[in-house]
Interface confidence: medium
């Protein structure tokens, strides 16, 4: 079974995937297609690092550029450091500016929907 067939087989299960399971899959030899990735719960995708998303998508990571204005990719980009996004070489913009400190305050996020940033 090739990677595409593999994810067609399992994508119906993935919509409700918790972050922990996505992290586990990122540690294994998978290449999730973008259509499947876009169906994931936003709250499950947000905690994933750039490296984890890169490993989860494998060669399909290039497709993030085309989806950068759509959820969950848009919201995920907003949570990443720009210098981490730059390592993908895809020209993704909108990450946390280099030098800013992220305060992971749940109340702040609940009010504003975005992380609280402190300037350099």
């Amino acid at each position: 079974m090739n990677g595409s067939e593999y994810f067609v087989k399992i994508q119906s299960f993935l919509g409700g995937a918790p972050t922990e399971d996505l992290k586990a899959l990122s540690q294994q030899n998978v290449s999730m297609d973008l259509a499947t990735f876009m169906k994931l719960r936003t709250d499950a995708v947000l905690p994933l690092t750039v490296a984890e998303v890169q490993k989860l998508l494998g060669p399909h990571v290039e497709g993030l550029k085309a989806e950068e204005r759509h959820r969950p990719v848009r919201d995920w980009i907003l949570r990443q450091r720009q210098d981490d996004l730059d390592t993908l070489g895809l020209g993704l913009q909108g990450g946390i500016p280099n030098g800013y400190l992220v305060l992971d305050l749940s109340m702040q996020e609940a009010l504003s929907g975005t992380p609280c940033l402190l300037g350099p």
Epitope: I10, Q11, K23, A24, L25, A51, E52
Partner: antibody, heavy 116, light 111 residues
Framework: EVKFEESGGGLVQPGGSMKLSCVAS????????MNWVRQSPEKGLEWVAQ??????????HYAESVKGRFSISRDDSKSSVYLQMNNLRAEDTGIYYC???????WGQGTTLTVSS | DIVLTQSPASLALSPGKRATISCRAS??????????IHWFQQKPGQPPKLLIY???NLETGVPARFSGSGSRTDFTLTIDPVEEDDVAIYYC?????????FGGGTKLEIK
Amino acid sequence: EVKFEESGGGLVQPGGSMKLSCVASGFTFSNYWMNWVRQSPEKGLEWVAQIRLKSDNYATHYAESVKGRFSISRDDSKSSVYLQMNNLRAEDTGIYYCSVGTGGYWGQGTTLTVSS
Amino acid sequence: DIVLTQSPASLALSPGKRATISCRASESVSIIGTDVIHWFQQKPGQPPKLLIYHASNLETGVPARFSGSGSRTDFTLTIDPVEEDDVAIYYCLQSRKIPWTFGGGTKLEIK
């Protein structure tokens, strides 16, 4: 090419301590969970400990048989993972392997013998 | 803990025959539809080598004589045809739940 260099095994008395090291190369070490797995004739292959990523605050997990005695750590700047073993018992004797992710690559193993 | 029961404990086959090794899990090893069972080959004096990941995916560089099948709790490693070089112990591993657990191993001998 993925490579591991394990060290630190040897003979130790019951109740003693030992620290194993594993230096990895050939992949982006900081992106992967690392594990220690041991093997003995009595117990076969036995997963021992796991350490996750910086983004997971280096979360650790242990087999029940080693909880409170063993401690796994990593130094991403050195592409290294360690296993500090205290209060060693005879049943800890075996070959200790470091492995990456879900076992895609393994080191050659280092032998620990706990005996008086 | 998830218990993996392998059978048979050993088997001896002539070259060209088919080897079938079973691994039964005490509960489902599926992560959102992905069966996280993996098969390893271990030859004397060597570390285990990954053959099959996610129940049925052939690791790069592993001969197509090796295949994996099954889902949820029942899995099979098949070697067809068996060759002299396949003499080894074969193990299954589940990475669904901590603690990760291995099967007891199946020793393959060639007649």
